[in-house]
């Protein structure tokens, strides 16, 4: 559904993403208009699930940090819309709301 | 300038406990996971324990789980492993170290611990 | 449990290329990291996410990982690069993973 509004995610997955199969993330909020946290994994792979994440785990705050001192191989979509082919895992329509595109910052290499 | 420094080690007998700190400086303690990292005399470097930003999420090498325990105290930049049941192969230089991403790049000088009757 | 296998030691001529290896069921699909540490100091991180330089740590080394085999090259080797050197990865628990450690002698 391409220029459709992102789904809220409704609950975690139970698995992880290997960290290189990870593109980019972007961070679901409450405050915006979504029931829970969660930080949606989208992978490589166009056609491949976005994996909804909760952002207290471990995993999940070493990859966001990961991804965060990447520069991005491609500029990421402006606003908070649904790749062509995202999954259907838990979500519930909520409009454009509670969607949050983390750009990932452009810095030299080195911690 | 950002720093580790370790404090807490020291002699005690096996089936003892010991509590060590880590008091950070420098950052925003709140922004990193911590772990703590061994090393016994004479070997190489073991991995410990790991632990998330806030305190929630706790990860534990296979060795010291259920005897062993990482927390830390955000609000006084401090990181702590409770060691209960200690043994004599715990003996060790333990190094807390700061988490970023999948690498440590800080880490302290490290604090002696002897489990020894 | 996962395991890190490295050579006890390399030895290199000064001036020369060392290449320290660390041998890992697919290494490659993890992130490795490299930690060199001399006698009574703690470890200091050379190499991160595969093949990244912190600043500070000179052009001299580099990393690269790929299948089971992940490698820290020095480059023009200094008697100042001997040490002891140490690979680690996360794997998905999460649990960390160093390997055995690698005592490098430039000759």
């Known amino acids: 559904s391409d220029g459709g509004a992102q789904d809220c995610c409704l609950k975690y997955s139970q698995r992880k993403i290997p960290a290189k199969v990870v593109r980019s993330y972007r961070k679901q909020e409450p405050s915006l208009g979504c029931s829970i946290p969660a930080i949606l994994f989208l992978p490589r792979k166009r056609s491949q699930a976005e994996l909804c994440a909760d952002p207290k785990e471990l995993w999940v705050q070493q990859l966001m940090q990961h991804l965060d001192k990447t520069p991005s191989p491609q500029k990421p979509a402006q606003g908070c819309r649904k790749d062509r082919g995202a999954s259907k895992t838990g979500k519930k329509g909520k409009g454009s709301k509670g969607c949050k595109r983390t750009e990932r910052s452009q810095t030299p290499k080195g911690p | 300038e950002v720093q580790l420094l370790e404090s807490g080690g020291g002699l005690v007998q096996p089936g003892g406990s010991l509590r060590l700190s880590c008091a950070a400086s420098?950052?925003?303690?709140?922004?990193?996971?911590m772990s703590w990292v061994r090393q016994a005399p004479g070997k190489g470097l073991e991995w410990v324990s790991a632990?998330?930003?806030?305190?929630?999420?706790?990860s534990y090498a296979d060795s010291v789980k259920g005897r062993f325990t990482i927390s830390r105290d955000n609000s006084k930049n401090t990181l702590y492993l409770q060691m209960n049941s200690l043994r004599a192969e715990d003996t060790a230089v333990y190094y807390c170290?700061?988490?970023?991403?999948?690498?440590?790049?800080?880490w302290g000088q490290g604090t002696l611990v002897t489990v020894s009757s | 449990s996962y395991e890190l296998t490295q050579p006890l030691s390399v030895s290199v001529a000064l001036g020369q290329t060392a290449r320290i290896t660390c041998g890992g069921d697919s290494i490659g699909s993890q992130y490795a990291s490299w930690y060199q540490q001399k006698p009574g100091q703690a470890p200091v991180l050379v190499i991160y996410d595969d093949n990244e330089r912190p600043s500070g740590i000179p052009e001299r080394f580099s990393g690269s990982n790929s299948g089971n085999t992940a490698t820290l090259t020095i480059s023009r080797a200094q008697a100042g690069d001997e040490a002891d050197y140490y690979c680690g990865s996360w794997d998905s628990n999460p649990t960390h993973v160093f390997g055995g450690g690698t005592k490098l002698t430039v000759l």
């Open positions: 420098g950052f925003t303690f709140n922004s990193y996971s």
């Open positions: 632990i998330s930003m806030e305190g929630y999420s706790k």
């Open positions: 170290a700061r988490g970023y991403g999948y690498y440590f790049d800080v």
